[in-house]
């Protein structure tokens, strides 16, 4: 199983059988009357993984997912029949597919489902403390799920619940045509993106939503939505997809005369993830599939990891691109996209930009406007007509950090762990695929920290049958990875150091930041441990320097090093 170290070949390739035999995967193979284990909520404090599925919500123990509680939340027979009469599939559509699962407060979760094409939401009691062992549906309190969950289970939803308000990117109608970014719940009138205007949203597929602070003043907080959508005519010849990042001010309450109960601070920009191609034409990875925000020292400046695939039928490929929030903010402070009419090209807007600059949050920091309802008419008019930025956001180092083009799978999900190793910190990516495998990739800084080399450490099959991975969460506390698909949920440790072999050289050559040779075995590396010198070299994977004892003998000839 141990492969030699070419970038595109995993050092360790483990089949599902091997994962099981080595106790490296625990699988929950689903219930007979459920499926679609797509909606994850990780609660490290309670040591639970909440999972929304078809007609069910689960609470798995993070230590071992075989230990779980479940809530059954189906639709009524009447509702199911109405759905069937509307021409929908009784098994695949006429059920309650859970699409939203968020922490509401200290004692409750908020959950929404498709409700057999009639979205519905409710609260789930989870108690104050883990030992309360409470997990029950609030049967007396159901709410309309419109603008929160889609009607159609096939549609993606991105949501975020903060301060009792739910931000959702979803379809608000039965037909799945009226896509919008909503803010619901709370005490205010719902707010949404402009209706019937393809410049705002053009058949989007929502990926995720995140709150990111702009400054130390909470009035400047913004909610960022990641999505992909059809490129607007004139942006591209032919039908194309663009990956997007959209921003909204948390304290946006809509306009006064125009954009009433609509966002006044919504802006969007294109995310570029491409490689130079032949004839000087870049190959674009435009189909954004997943996003992970790596919050390290500064929560205002997380690193954004995006997983992309190509939309081409001829060329199938996947990539991971990294973005910095400073680059994102720079684009949102740059020129707006403008065109004089449907038959004109998009150009950077050259005219006078009204004050305060559209997209700026009303706060005491900038502009002195207390509310979006106080914004001057020219700001609202401009915002309504110019939701898109002209410049795209380019990835760090202007290229992907991971590319896969010669394989029979595509990337679907990503989570990232920052690991302390002997020679520094490394970001380890766990990338889910559409065939049920997980790739473990480490990005290794070269000359500069953003000039990265990627090393494919492991390729693990985590489900018995090939099935697309649709959800992933990583628990740093448990050092475990949790994976969701249509078929079920899987759990695996972040590291399998013992599998790298019985010698120092093999451990060193693995270049796995989690693992180091401790003198007798390849085991988990803890930077705080006062153990005897650990042999590890992630940057170069050089056993000659680090394995001075007999651990190398007789083994070096088997592992040709290609870096």
């Amino acid at each position: 199983n141990y492969q030699n170290g070419k970038n595109n070949v995993p050092r360790l390739k483990l089949s599902y059988k091997e994962m099981l035999e080595s106790n490296n995967v625990i699988t929950f193979n689903g219930l007979a009357n459920s499926s679609s284990y797509h909606t994850f909520l990780l609660d490290e404090e309670r040591s639970r993984l909440y999972v929304g599925a078809k007609d069910h919500i689960f609470s798995f123990d993070l230590v071992n997912i075989k230990d779980f509680q479940k809530i059954v939340w189906p639709v009524s027979y009447t509702r199911r029949d109405e759905c069937k009469w509307a021409g929908k599939d009784i098994l695949k559509e006429c059920a309650n597919f859970i699409k939203v699962l968020k922490a509401y407060n200290q004692t409750h979760l908020y959950a929404c489902g498709t409700g057999a094409f009639h979205p519905i939401c409710t609260y789930i009691e989870i108690g104050h403390h883990p030992e309360d062992n409470i997990f029950k549906l609030e049967n007396s309190h159901f709410e309309n799920g419109r603008g929160k969950s889609p009607y159609d289970p096939k549609l993606l939803t991105a949501s975020l619940l903060i301060d009792g308000e739910l931000y959702s990117g979803t379809a608000a109608d039965f037909m799945g045509r009226d896509f919008a970014i909503f803010r619901t719940l709370g005490h205010h009138h719902p707010i949404r993106t402009e209706q019937h205007d393809s410049r705002w949203l053009n058949d989007p597929k929502f990926i995720s939503a995140h709150l990111i602070s702009e400054s130390d003043n909470p009035e400047d907080d913004k909610v960022y939505f990641f999505f992909r959508e059809n490129a607007i005519d004139g942006e591209h010849s032919g039908k194309a997809t663009h990956a997007r990042i959209g921003q909204i001010c948390k304290n946006d309450f809509g306009g006064h005369r125009s954009l009433v109960n609509k966002w006044t601070t919504f802006l969007k920009a294109r995310l570029i993830c491409s490689v130079p191609g032949p004839n000087g034409i870049d190959t674009h990875f435009d189909e954004l599939q997943d996003v992970f925000l790596m919050n390290f020292k500064d929560p205002k400046n997380p690193v954004v990891y995006g997983v992309f695939t190509t939309s081409s039928n001829i060329f199938k490929g996947s990539a991971v691109c990294m973005y910095s929030m400073s680059d994102v903010r720079r684009v949102f402070l740059g020129p707006y996209a403008h065109r004089d009419g449907p038959n004109y090209q998009w150009v950077p807007y050259q005219g006078r930009v009204p004050y305060p600059r559209p997209g700026t949050c009303p706060s005491k920091t900038f502009g002195g406007f207390d509310s979006t309802k106080d914004l001057p008419d020219d700001v609202i008019t401009f915002a309504r007509s110019h939701p898109a930025m002209y410049n795209p956001v380019f990835p760090m180092n202007n290229r992907p950090i991971v590319i896969k083009t010669d394989v029979n799978y595509q990337f679907t999900q990503i989570v990232v762990d920052r690991v302390d190793a002997e020679d520094g910190q490394y970001d380890v990516m766990f990338i889910g695929t559409d065939v049920g495998t997980v790739l473990k990739v480490v990005s290794i800084p070269k000359e500069t920290w953003y000039d990265l080399e990627e090393v494919l450490l492991e390729e693990m099959t985590v489900f018995r049958e090939p099935t697309a991975i649709s959800a992933m969460e990583l628990s740093t506390k448990q050092q475990q990875l949790y994976i969701g698909s249509t078929a079920g949920v899987a759990q695996l440790p972040l590291h399998r150091c013992d599998i790298y072999g019985k010698a120092c050289a093999e451990c060193c050559l693995a270049r796995d930041p989690y693992c180091a040779w401790d003198g007798s075995a390849c085991s988990r590396y803890f930077p705080t441990a006062k153990a005897r010198t650990r042999a590890q070299d992630i940057r170069n994977g050089d056993p000659l320097t680090h394995c001075s004892d007999g651990g190398i003998e007789g083994r070096m000839d088997h592992h040709h090093h290609h870096h």
Partner: antibody, heavy 123, light 112 residues
Framework: EVQLLESGGGLVQPGGSLRLSCAAS????????MNWVRQAPGKGLEWVSG????????DYADSVKGRFTISRDNSKNTLYLQMNSLRAEDTAVYYC????????????????WGQGTLVTVSS | QSVLTQPPSVSGAPGQRVTISCTGS?????????VHWYQQLPGTAPKLLIY???NRPSGVPDRFSGSKSGTSASLAITGLQAEDEADYYC???????????FGGGTKLTVLG
């Protein structure tokens, strides 16, 4: 005070054309979606067509699709309905109506209506 | 044939309470879309009476109230007055063509 004033109705032969206008005042016209709704003599209301504030979205009832064209001129605060290939069943009072979107879920309501203009299609 | 079904007529004596029903399907009212009600006095244009199932625009007396449940909605008028004699229409969103759907209308007659 919000006012909508339709004009352009009249008697026309089957296959003929008419252009209806609706002059709006008392509100920011270019902030609202506008619609045409008709009512055949002694019958109920039927939505005919709708247009978004910037004409980016336009929709028609199947019964008029391909024959009627809705448009607006925000600089003149005016909504139009060009009706071609008129049929006897198009005989109705045509109302211009503003979409209010007052409800929580932004489902269109018609918060202001004009007094209507009668279109009679007959030979 | 209207997409939403209303009774053709209802009647009541002054001071009485009457209700007008409006029945749709799973692709309009039953899909969670809001219902709005209009009053059309003889020879005049319709006027918005109730929006968003149960909300009254300013100027509409509180004798008028609306509710919605499942695939149906209803308009209730209490303390019936002679000037309430009119046609009443319910309306909802459909998401499919036609994008807006109306009921066939209900003629309210105030007896006496």
């Amino acid at each position: 005070e919000v006012q909508l004033l339709e004009s352009g109705g009249g008697l026309v032969q089957p296959g003929g054309s008419l252009r209806l206008s609706c002059a709006a005042s008392g509100f920011t016209f270019d902030s609202y979606e506008m619609n045409w709704v008709r009512q055949a003599p002694g019958k109920g209301l039927e939505w005919v067509s709708g247009i978004s504030w910037n004409s980016g979205w336009i929709d028609y009832a199947d019964s008029v699709k391909g024959r009627f064209t809705i448009s607006r001129d925000n600089s003149k605060n005016t909504l139009y309905l060009q009706m071609n290939s008129l049929r006897a069943e198009d005989t109705a009072v045509y109302y211009c109506a503003r979409s209010g979107y007052s409800s929580s879920w932004f489902d269109p309501d018609f918060d202001y209506w004009g007094q209507g203009t009668l279109v009679t299609v007959s030979s | 044939q209207s997409v939403l079904t209303q009774p053709p007529s209802v009647s009541g004596a002054p001071g009485q309470r009457v209700t007008i029903s409006c029945t749709g399907s799973s692709s309009n009212i039953g899909a969670g879309y809001d219902v709005h009600w209009y009053q059309q006095l003889p020879g005049t244009a319709p006027k918005l009476l109730i929006y968003g199932n149960s909300n009254r625009p300013s100027g509409v007396p509180d004798r008028f109230s609306g509710s919605k449940s499942g695939t149906s909605a209803s308009l209730a008028i209490t303390g019936l007055q002679a000037e309430d004699e009119a046609d009443y229409y319910c309306q909802s969103y459909a998401g499919i063509n036609p994008y807006v759907v109306f009921g066939g209308g209900t003629k309210l007659t105030v007896l006496g």
